[in-house]
Interface confidence: medium
């Protein structure tokens, strides 16, 4: 027999997902008595949050289940779960188990651009000029697609002068210069760049959006017949 | 560099309350859980409790009663608060990194641990 | 909670010698879902704070000289030094993390002669 177990859930999920099976043997007969009968029951849960009745268990299949909504890997990823198995159908002998539930993370935080608003100045004729590094925060698990970034300008770019990739590592947004700036035609850009996660959002999050306004500086160019 | 740095009384008296502050920099407590752990003198390691980056807690059973961890983000600090000490709380007080904030990273392994202060219970 | 229990409780060795700690788990800390075993050893120096040298029983942590070895599984795992360095005077600790509260052993000490 086991004494601890492990299972996982998806966080969010609604009321009645299962979760993870539990099982206690008996030697005794259970066909013509109710000795060999088990009965399954959740004695505590720890910790308590949001509250003590997140699970139950069904007595007679040792199948755990999500009773309660908000569960939360941010804020709790993994729960322990003391079990009782008692025979003959719940009025014998007790054994305990203990049962630890994961909490896997969903995408249920949107990255958010910290600062919001950024200015930065980039010589003309420059191709592939870094212009800005943008950060965002995401309370998602690190290096997981619920937390890597994909950036897009959303506006402002009208000459098609700008790209942005995401830094692997750090997260940030790389925004560069596709194209030379001409500080003749146009000597300011604002833009606007939002972000998304690379896992699509599992409920509707706000998106954010960062505001990046880029000061083309004039070179000295030779004069042209 | 990631660090971690703890702060605390030094001293307690038998029945009074212990609080001590782990003050982190190098990485942000909303991606990584810290551990607190203590070591009585010349003995071993015992863990005590875990704070999620949440704000979520797991805690020793056997202290559970006796303790409190919280966080403060913003000022990259995690507080212990343990009441109701006796002679037997004195050890050496640990916070600990954990490696990640996801199973797969091994996140129950603390990959960082600061230097440790030293609580003395005594009247 | 699980018990860790750890052997032998001291050893002294030799620069240059192969050295093997033990620590036993009292139930399997295998996952069967992921396979993986739920265990970490740390290295704590005298005065100083536990490092950690092996996480999920066998995985290397960044910058470990590649002398320190995990192995096992279920419940029985072993902590290998292959060629013992005067710097590895330590205590060594296993501790599980399968299930709540994490536990350590008591310690293997290793004395250079």
């Known amino acids: 027999t086991q004494d601890t177990f492990r299972g996982s859930v998806l966080e969010g999920v609604l009321p009645g997902t299962s979760v993870m099976q539990v099982t206690a043997t008996d030697e005794d007969d259970a066909i013509y008595t109710y000795n060999g009968v088990v009965a399954y029951s959740i004695h505590s849960q720890e910790p308590k949050d949001p509250h003590d009745l997140m699970f139950t268990i069904h007595r007679s299949t040792g199948t755990i289940s999500v009773i309660s909504s908000g569960l939360d890997r941010e804020k709790v990823p993994e729960y322990t779960l003391t079990i009782q198995a008692t025979d003959m159908d719940g009025d014998g002998s007790t054994t305990t188990a203990v049962a630890v539930v994961e909490i896997l993370d969903a995408n249920d935080n949107a990255p958010m651009f910290d600062p919001q608003k950024y200015e930065a100045h980039v010589p003309e004729n420059a191709v592939g000029h870094e212009v800005q590094r943008l950060t965002v925060t995401d309370l998602d698990a690190p290096n997981s697609p619920a937390w890597r970034a994909t950036y897009l300008i959303m506006g402002g770019d009208d000459g098609d002068h700008f790209t942005i990739t995401t830094h692997p590592e750090s997260n940030q947004g790389i925004l560069t210069t596709r194209k030379g700036l001409d500080f003749e035609a146009k000597n300011q850009h604002t833009l606007y760049v939002e972000v998304t996660n690379e896992a699509p959002f599992v409920l509707k999050l706000p998106t954010s959006t960062a505001t990046i306004v880029v000061h083309v500086e004039d070179v000295n160019e030779a004069p042209v017949f | 560099v990631q660090l971690l740095e703890e702060s605390g009384p030094g001293l307690v008296a038998p029945s009074q309350s212990l609080s001590i502050t782990c003050t982190v920099s190098g990485f942000s407590l909303t991606s990584y859980p810290i551990n607190w752990v203590r070591q009585p003198p010349g003995k071993g390691l015992e863990w005590l409790g875990v704070i999620w980056t949440g704000g979520g807690t797991n805690y020793n059973s056997a202290l559970k009663s006796r303790l409190s961890i919280t966080k403060d983000n913003s000022k990259s600090q995690v507080f212990l608060k343990m009441t109701s000490l006796q002679t037997d709380d004195t050890a050496r007080y640990y916070c600990?990194?954990?490696?990640?904030?996801?199973?797969?990273?091994?996140?129950?392994?603390?990959?960082?641990w600061g230097q440790g202060t030293t609580v003395t219970v005594s009247s | 909670e699980l018990v860790m229990t750890q052997s032998p409780s001291s050893l002294a060795v030799s620069v240059g010698e192969k050295v093997t700690m033990s620590c036993k788990s009292s139930?399997?800390?295998?996952?069967?879902?992921?396979?993986?075993?739920?265990l970490a050893w740390y290295q704590q120096k005298p005065g100083q704070s536990p490092k950690l040298l092996i996480y999920?029983?066998?995985t290397r942590e960044s910058g470990v000289p590649d002398r320190f070895t995990g192995s096992g599984s279920g419940t029985d795992f072993t902590l290998t030094i292959s060629s013992v360095k005067a710097e590895d005077l330590a205590v060594y600790y296993c501790?599980?993390?399968?299930?709540?509260?994490?536990?350590f052993g008591g310690g293997t000490k290793l004395e250079i002669k």
């Open positions: 139930q399997s800390l295998l996952y069967s879902s992921n396979q993986k075993n739920y």
């Open positions: 600990a990194k954990s490696r990640g904030v996801y199973d797969f990273d091994g996140r129950g392994a603390m990959d960082y």
């Open positions: 501790q599980q993390y399968y299930s709540y509260p994490y536990t």
């Open positions: 999920w029983a066998s």
